[in-house]
């Protein structure tokens, strides 16, 4: 396993919002991660988060299969060789209907300042 510092992610932005899907963009150092681990959690519910991963070379992904007019918290981490970054989160409200598709309604995003070393 790598013993070097794992660089943190930059910023995460919801680029497009639809009624049942959205597009997530983020920034990260080139070549730093094997993949990104993304969790999509419906707010105010005990339902399990939707988990997915994206290859480390990508900086955006579509997130399908969401509910209309629903608040979600989306968390992203960069992962490489036994390391994971501090999670970066964004909250979003999906559109209320088929025709109500609009540019990013990003409520907030926040990041930690240290990487996590998993033992």
């Amino acid at each position: 396993a790598s013993t070097g510092e794992t660089p943190n992610l930059g910023e995460v932005v919801v680029a497009e919002v639809g009624w049942d899907a959205l597009k997530l963009n983020w920034t990260a150092p080139e070549g730093a991660y094997e993949y990104f681990f993304i969790q999509v959690q419906e707010a105010d519910t005990v339902e399990a988060a939707q988990n997915l991963t994206v290859p480390g070379g990508l900086r955006s992904t579509d997130l399908p299969g969401l509910k209309a007019a629903t608040h979600y918290t989306i968390t992203i981490r960069g992962v490489t060789q036994d390391f994971s970054t501090t999670p970066l989160s964004v909250e979003v409200l999906t559109a209320s209907g088929l025709n109500d598709i609009f540019e990013a309604q990003k409520i907030e995003w926040h990041e930690g300042t240290h990487h996590h070393h998993h033992h």
Partner: antibody, heavy 121, light 107 residues
Framework: QVQLVQSGAEVKKPGSSVKVSCKAS????????ISWVRQAPGQGLEWMGG????????NYAQKFQGRVTITADKSTSTAYMELSSLRSEDTAVYYC??????????????WGQGTTVTVSS | DIQMTQSPSSLSASVGDRVTITCRAS??????LGWYQQKPGKAPKRLIY???SLQSGVPSRFSGGGSGTEFTLTISSLQPEDFATYYC?????????FGQGTKVEIK
């Protein structure tokens, strides 16, 4: 070269539990997902669940929710699948696998040799 | 869970035939869709990943296509060694799901 080596065949009584192990060697264990897939005699492949050891939390297919528990021990590079309340329909070959698309983007998929679980009274 | 409906469940074909197998997802999925070939008593073997990328070492007669909810595996000219069972797997959204399988038999 990654190898996934599973525990041996099991014969179980209905209502009991079985725990199958899958030891990984030849590569990083913690950051790559391990899935469990089963195949009953003459039937298709069923994805049961999977885990990324570095995060610890597992995903389960709805069909097995509440009856299956998938865990991973990073210190021994071993994943486990425990299935409870066994019935005859659970008689199958159980595979652990590293499958492309979720926390793994390697050139090849890797499969364990399979563990036959027979449920019979 | 996302349902993957695979069709047909079985088909009979001759050597040299063009064969197409379809997988339909119950909702839009990311294109993390793989196709696997399985022969009796063996573990499955990946043929296609990311819906259309050919696995290294797999003959070019195999091809994949589709996006969103509908995906296809095509064998352009069936060979004797291709008689097997084929499965699709969506592994882009958890929990992952296999299709029910398509058994390709000799006519």
């Amino acid at each position: 070269q990654v190898q996934l080596v599973q525990s041996g065949a099991e014969v179980k009584k209905p209502g009991s539990s079985v725990k199958v192990s899958c030891k990984a060697s030849g590569g990083t264990f913690s950051s790559y997902a391990i899935s469990w897939v089963r195949q009953a005699p003459g039937q298709g492949l069923e994805w049961m669940g999977g885990i990324i050891p570095i995060f610890g939390t597992a995903n389960y297919a709805q069909k097995f929710q509440g009856r299956v528990t998938i865990t991973a021990d990073k210190s021994t590079s071993t994943a486990y699948m425990e299935l409870s309340s066994l019935r005859s329909e659970d008689t199958a070959v159980y595979y652990c696998a590293r499958l492309y698309g979720y926390a793994y983007y390697g050139a090849f998929d890797y499969w364990g040799q399979g563990t036959t679980v027979t449920v019979s009274s | 869970d996302i349902q993957m409906t695979q069709s047909p469940s079985s088909l009979s074909a001759s050597v040299g035939d063009r064969v197409t197998i379809t997988c339909r997802a119950s909702q839009g999925i990311r294109n993390v869709l793989g196709w696997y070939q399985q022969k009796p008593g063996k573990a499955p073997k990946r043929l296609i990943y990311d819906s259309s990328s050919l696995q290294s070492g797999v003959p070019s007669r195999f091809s994949g296509g589709g996006s969103g909810t509908e995906f296809t595996l095509t064998i352009s000219s069936l060979q004797p060694e291709d008689f097997a069972t084929y499965y699709c797997l969506q592994n882009g959204l958890q929990p992952a799901t296999f299709g029910q399988g398509t058994k390709v038999e000799i006519k």
